[in-house]
Interface confidence: low
């Protein structure tokens, strides 16, 4: 009779993580008598995966009934495959011996590769806020995918970015891989509503790439512009001076009025108006009693925004002129700013 052959028909199989893998093995003869065992790897360090006769292998089931007398199919199914299960599996026939069975013949091996989906990309921005015109870095990470082939793209508001560096680790063979990418983004004043998107494409995600996003509202600080204007006279001896705080983000803002360098009033921004681009405007006014001043008054609007050093703008109120004249020389509203920057 022809000598027994151990046939593993599949040179390699590729299975998605979480699926079951079927490893095929048939023998061509019932002789010699003896069990079949499955191993991962070869040589002295090989790992026993299944032993027909003894042991507990909870994830392994046999495809056919091994108790049948004429059974020659020793295929096994391994459930809930993870990337750690990757490797070459050998179906090995043993000859009955005393006290131990003797290895008789091995199949050629089946290489199991595991396809695992990448985790959802996590995008993180800088720890501190930055102002427009500055370049900030965003990182994107995704883990646990296999095979190693993967593509990563960066977008800002749907426009693809080109200034980024990507690494896939480890460089050599591994059961699964991670990707890490850093993109550089130049901030503009209009970026409060902007989004940075990291898009990962992998063969396990065909047609449906994974995306991670970061809102630039978490990253950007748009400093305010200040405008101090003198409004028309309300009463004979009173002048209304307004400080318009425009286009700032985030909302956190404190304003202090100074008269000739002395603190007159401090207030925290409330009832802000939001612009289309996501920035905010706020207005504060100061009613100045001109009759209480003998000399010209320097009014300063000082703004501390988001914990940054204060910025200020001043307005010189001339007391010598009659208030009514002064009012008539000043156009109403914020269109005319009789203000001098510090």
């Amino acid at each position: 009779e022809e000598e027994l052959q151990v046939i593993q028909p599949d040179k390699s199989i590729s299975v998605a993580a979480g699926e079951s893998a079927t490893l095929h093995c048939t023998v061509t003869s019932l002789i010699p008598v003896g069990p079949i065992q499955w191993f991962r790897g070869a040589g002295p360090g090989r790992e026993l995966i299944y032993n027909q006769k003894e042991g507990h292998f909870p994830r392994v089931t046999t495809v056919s009934d091994l108790t049948k007398r004429n059974n020659m199919d020793f295929s096994i199914r391994i459930s809930n495959i993870t990337p750690a299960d990757a490797g070459t599996y050998y179906c090995v026939k043993f000859r009955k011996g005393s006290p131990d069975h003797v290895e008789f013949k091995s199949g050629a091996g089946t290489e199991l590769s595991v396809r695992a989906k990448p985790s959802a990309p996590v995008v993180s921005g800088p720890a501190a806020r930055a102002t427009p015109q500055h370049t900030v870095s965003f990182t994107c990470e995704s883990h646990g995918f296999s095979p190693r082939d993967i593509t990563l793209k960066w977008f800002k508001n749907g426009n693809e970015l080109s200034d980024f560096q990507t690494n896939v680790d480890p460089a050599g063979d591994s059961v699964s891989y991670s990707i890490h990418s850093t993109a550089k983004v130049v901030l503009t004043r209009e970026d409060v509503h902007s989004q940075v998107i990291c898009e990962v494409a992998h063969v396990t995600l065909q047609g449906d790439p994974l995306r991670g996003t970061a809102n630039l509202s978490e990253t950007i600080r748009v400093p305010p512009t200040l405008e101090v204007t003198q409004q028309p006279v309300r009463a004979e001896n009173q002048v209304n001076v307004t400080c318009q705080v425009r286009k700032f983000y985030p909302q956190r803002l404190q304003l202090t009025w100074l008269e000739n360098g002395n603190v007159s009033r401090t207030e925290t921004a409330s009832t802000l108006t939001e612009n289309k681009d996501g920035t905010y405007n706020w207005m504060s006014w100061l009613l100045v009693n001109v009759s209480a001043h003998r000399d010209d008054v320097k009014l300063t609007c000082q703004v501390e925004h988001d914990g940054q050093p204060a910025v200020s703008k001043s307005h010189d109120l001339k007391v010598s002129a009659h208030p009514k004249e002064q009012g008539s020389n000043t156009a109403p509203g914020p269109a005319l700013a009789s203000a001098a920057p510090l």
């Epitope: 299975v15 893998a21 593509t151 047609g207 790439p209």
Partner: antibody, heavy 129, light 110 residues
């Protein structure tokens, strides 16, 4: 709506070259295998080549290996088949098609259970002197 | 390479007939087998994918099945618009990169 439109076919002399285009709309070719399949007059379907542009994967039938080059331009959402050293037996209608798998997987054999779900109308290539 | 042997190469049938077309794979393959219908001068149309799943919009008289290495397309009750050529197709590589077609079966009016 998913659409594939081939162009670039025509009459060419043996040994000549042609470049076929397959313009896709309604989906992003970056994330799909695009295949070229040909059909000689009165004959059956013959697979020619496939490309998965995101990973730069390209595959060819033995009959065209070394003569044909498949590629894709994701910015134009278009796949191409550059055909060099053309022979009379390359005369055929050339179709491009999208390969899709609906998430089903055969763990037994390690294969996605996919198919060519959308095809173009085809473009005729005639190689004759 | 895996070969897909399709039979018969042609058949004559009448409206209302039950028609069966078979494709045999040259070796053990996955269920990544699809069936297509092609009419003269037109591109093929997908009917069945994954050996037995009916593609959307395809009439339920079409069905697919598998037995070992044999894959079968059945038309339960042939309609006038079903006279066409049918092809089986196997996606060989695990991501569907390589494709093999059967030789085709022409279904003609008896």
């Amino acid at each position: 709506e998913v659409q594939l439109v081939e162009s670039g076919g025509g009459l060419v002399q043996p040994g000549g070259s042609l470049r076929l285009s397959c313009a896709a709309s309604g989906f992003n070719i970056s994330y799909y295998f695009i295949h070229w399949v040909r059909q000689a007059p009165g004959k059956g379907l013959e697979w020619v080549a496939s490309v998965y542009s995101s990973f730069g994967y390209t595959y060819y039938a033995d009959s065209v290996k070394g003569r044909f080059t498949i590629s894709a331009d994701t910015s134009k959402n278009t796949a191409y088949l550059q055909m060099n050293s053309l022979r009379a037996e390359d005369t055929a209608v050339y179709y491009c098609a999208r390969f899709t798998f609906p998430g089903l997987f055969d763990g037994f054999f390690g294969a996605y259970l996919g198919s060519l779900d959308y095809w173009g109308q085809g473009t005729l290539v005639t190689v004759s002197s | 390479d895996i070969q897909m042997t399709q039979s018969p190469s042609s058949l004559s049938a009448s409206v209302g007939d039950r028609v069966t077309i078979t494709c045999r794979a040259s070796q053990s393959v996955s269920s990544a087998v699809a069936w297509y219908q092609q009419k003269p001068g037109k591109a093929p149309k997908l009917l069945i994918y994954s050996a037995s799943s009916l593609y959307s919009g395809v009439p339920s008289r079409f069905s697919g099945s598998r037995s070992g290495t044999d894959f079968t397309l059945t038309i339960s009750s042939l309609q006038p618009e079903d006279f066409a050529t049918y092809y089986c197709q196997q996606a060989v590589n695990w991501v569907g990169a390589l494709v093999t077609f059967g030789q085709g079966t022409k279904v003609e009016i008896k």
